[in-house]
């Protein structure tokens, strides 16, 4: 059984990472940004189902097109590389997930933009950690 | 010094047509970002549209998008708002505002606003 | 779309007397450049709105320095050290992290 201990880490990094998942939305879904409309062109999959941490895999198994979609943004958009911020995030997914259990991910038949995608994770984010508080 | 100067409001009936225009002065027009903003009679502020430099992008609102075109002319100062297929609801003060993209400001220069009422 | 609401959405306060005004975002704020775009407009009586504050602390220019902003991340506060009667009207917060979008307004006016 979980304890109010490891409860609360989970909360922190699911709090880190609604965090880190919010800050790209807004670096991307703005006005200012030059690339938005090349970036709104790239599809991403998401996940048929996302209540609990092991569908976290669905969000890991997106990172590395996620990256590609960050490597277009210019640099002053991101005052941390597009590398390194997936980095920091994919910690977190392997942590909240856990490595023990092997899920395989079911994708939906409809294809997403990159600012649905982010928000559909946020979402997920944010539910979990109400269930938790 | 400067100014924003809008212009080009009035009564309209719904699904008619009105064409805003926001007159610039006492800054280079072309280095600004310009936006729309609306607000309603006794509400509050409502973007609506925005418009690069350049006129390279534009984004609008969802309560108007496919029925309003934001535009400008660099040559003559001017930014325009095209008004199409017009609603109960459009009716409000039509304000511009310039931002420049680069200094973080935000939008630090407002015109006094034009009203457009649309009414049968 | 980030909604930003403001509260109180009225505020009768005796001049040269304090004032706060406090404004919440359902998302953060905070953009991957490392920059807050959280703004505070005044609005007096017929008159366009006007730009005080501007990434959540710096005064825009001629500002009078009785206006600070405060915050961080998704909640953020405009006060008033002491109002003035050119204070009176109405105070907005806005984003433009993302898709501009405005708080409700909160009306000042003097008791």
């Known amino acids: 059984a979980p304890t109010s201990s490891s409860t609360k880490k989970t909360q922190l990094q699911l709090e880190h990472l609604l965090l880190d998942l919010q800050m790209i939305l807004n670096g991307i879904n703005n006005y200012k940004n030059p690339k938005l409309t090349r970036m709104l062109t790239f599809k991403f999959y998401m996940p048929k189902k996302a209540t609990e941490l092991k569908h976290l895999q669905c969000l890991e198994e997106e990172l590395k097109p996620l990256e590609e979609v960050l490597n277009l943004a210019q640099s002053k958009n991101f005052h941390l590389r597009p590398r390194d911020l997936i980095s920091n995030i994919n910690v977190i997914v392997l942590e909240l997930k856990g490595s023990e259990t092997t899920f395989m991910c079911e994708y939906a038949d409809e294809t997403a933009t990159i600012v649905e995608f982010l928000n559909r994770w946020i979402t997920f984010c944010q539910s979990i950690i109400s269930t938790l508080t | 010094q400067v100014q924003l100067v809008e212009s080009g409001g009035g009564v309209v009936q719904p699904g008619r047509s009105l064409r805003l225009s926001c007159a610039a002065s006492g800054f280079t027009f072309s280095s600004y970002g310009m936006h729309w903003v609306r607000q309603a009679p006794g509400k509050g502020l409502e973007w609506v549209a925005v418009?690069?430099?350049?006129?390279?992008?534009?984004y609008y609102a969802d309560s108007v998008k496919g029925r309003f075109t934001i535009s400008r002319d660099n040559s003559k100062n001017t930014l325009y708002l095209q008004m199409n297929s017009l609603r109960a609801e459009d009716t409000a003060v039509y304000y511009c505002?310039?931002?420049?993209?680069?200094?973080?400001?935000?939008?630090?220069?407002w015109g006094q606003g034009t009203t457009v009422t649309v009414s049968s | 779309d980030i909604v930003m609401t403001q509260t109180p959405l009225s505020s009768p306060v005796t001049l040269g007397q304090p004032a706060s005004i406090s404004c919440r975002s359902s998302?953060?704020?905070?953009?991957?450049?490392?920059?807050?775009?959280l703004s505070w407009l005044q609005q007096r009586p017929g008159q366009p709105p006007r730009l005080l504050i501007y990434k959540i602390s710096n005064r825009f220019s001629g500002v009078p320095d009785r206006f600070s902003g405060s915050g961080a991340g998704t909640d953020f506060t405009l006060k008033i050290s002491r109002v003035e009667a050119e204070d009176v009207g109405v105070y907005y917060c806005m984003q433009t992290t993302q898709f501009p979008t405005f708080g409700q307004g909160t009306k000042v006016e003097i008791k």
């Open positions: 998302q953060s704020l905070v953009h991957s450049d490392g920059n807050t775009y």
């Open positions: 505002a310039r931002e420049d993209f680069d200094s973080h400001y935000g939008m630090d220069v």
């Open positions: 418009i690069w430099y350049d006129g390279s992008n534009k």
